[in-house]
């Protein structure tokens, strides 16, 4: 994965500072907290299963 | 490089316990949810069990046909978690993986580890 | 419980030539955005290895011949061009809701 301040992450994912690695920003269905969810310009996240 | 360290396993009466235990190094182990997957050639995969991270208050989840006879639990000070697993039954044996999971799929695991429930 | 059936059971395939394996889920695992289907390998002796993440993202290290495709309910993992190194189960899974489950997984050889 990218290093913040290069390459910026693929389509589809955003950088976590908190996992130091570009993430899937389908994860934010699960968790919509996460700090790379910041990034993901997708719709708001469905309600997750639990 | 990211490691799953799997102890516990081996042979058990039908009715007994045995808890598995699982070290994690070579990712920031707190922030991911953590599972126990068995496999058998009846059943196949099987997911077993869940524990999620502190951001998630520790919930645990579990399948059904394990809940009120197994365990999960994790300590992040040392990168670790368990499977603690009562009155087991034949049906419970088979190859036992741990594994992390940010929140959708099984992207680490561990090597294995065989449980034989026979008299 | 979310049924996952893959097809075909096992599967032999001349190398080089492309293997198709079908998964389907007895309720969609879809929303709009993204499909929470997962491939894995697995190799006798070794755990399962991710391949295919979200239907169709191919996980770091895996080589550009695995590709996933599907939305809904009906999912595919292709392989072109198979090699001998592609000689495994594949398995589907899905991650939609609790409880997690896999497919029966599909047995490739190659020919």
């Known amino acids: 994965e990218q290093a913040p301040g290069t390459a910026p992450c693929s389509r589809g994912s955003s950088w976590s500072a908190d996992l130091d690695k570009c993430m899937d920003c389908a994860a934010c269905r699960a968790r919509p907290h996460s700090d790379f969810c910041l990034g993901c310009a997708a719709a708001p996240p469905a309600p997750f299963r639990l | 490089q990211v490691q799953l360290q799997q102890s516990g396993g081996g042979l058990v009466q039908p009715g007994g316990s045995m808890k598995l235990s699982c070290i994690a190094s070579g990712f920031t182990f707190s922030s991911y949810w953590m599972s126990w997957v068995r496999q058998s050639p009846e059943k196949g995969l099987e997911w077993v069990a869940e524990?999620?991270?502190?951001?998630?208050?520790?919930?645990?989840h579990y399948a059904e046909s394990v809940k009120g006879k197994f365990t999960i639990s994790r300590d992040d000070s040392k990168s670790r978690f368990f499977l603690q697993m009562n009155n087991l039954r034949a049906e419970d044996t088979g190859i036992y993986y741990c594994?992390?999971?940010?929140?959708?799929?099984?992207?680490?695991w561990g090597q294995g580890t065989d449980l034989t429930v026979s008299s | 419980d979310i049924v996952m059936t893959q097809t075909p059971a096992s599967l032999a395939v001349s190398l080089g030539q492309r293997a198709t394996i079908s998964c389907r889920a007895s309720q969609s695992v879809s929303t709009s955005t993204y499909s929470y289907m997962h491939w894995y390998q697995q190799k006798p002796g070794q755990p399962p290895k991710l391949l295919i993440k979200y239907a169709s993202s191919l996980e770091s290290g895996v080589p550009a011949r695995f590709s996933g495709s599907g939305s809904g309910t009906d999912f595919t993992l292709n392989i072109h061009p198979v090699e001998e190194d592609d000689t495994a189960t594949y398995y589907c899974?899905?991650?939609?809701?609790?409880?997690?489950?896999f497919g029966g997984g599909t047995k490739l050889e190659i020919k």
């Open positions: 524990i999620r991270s502190k951001s998630d208050n520790y919930a645990t």
């Open positions: 899974q899905h991650s939609w809701e609790i409880p997690y489950t």
């Open positions: 594994s992390s999971t940010y929140a959708d799929y099984f992207h680490y």
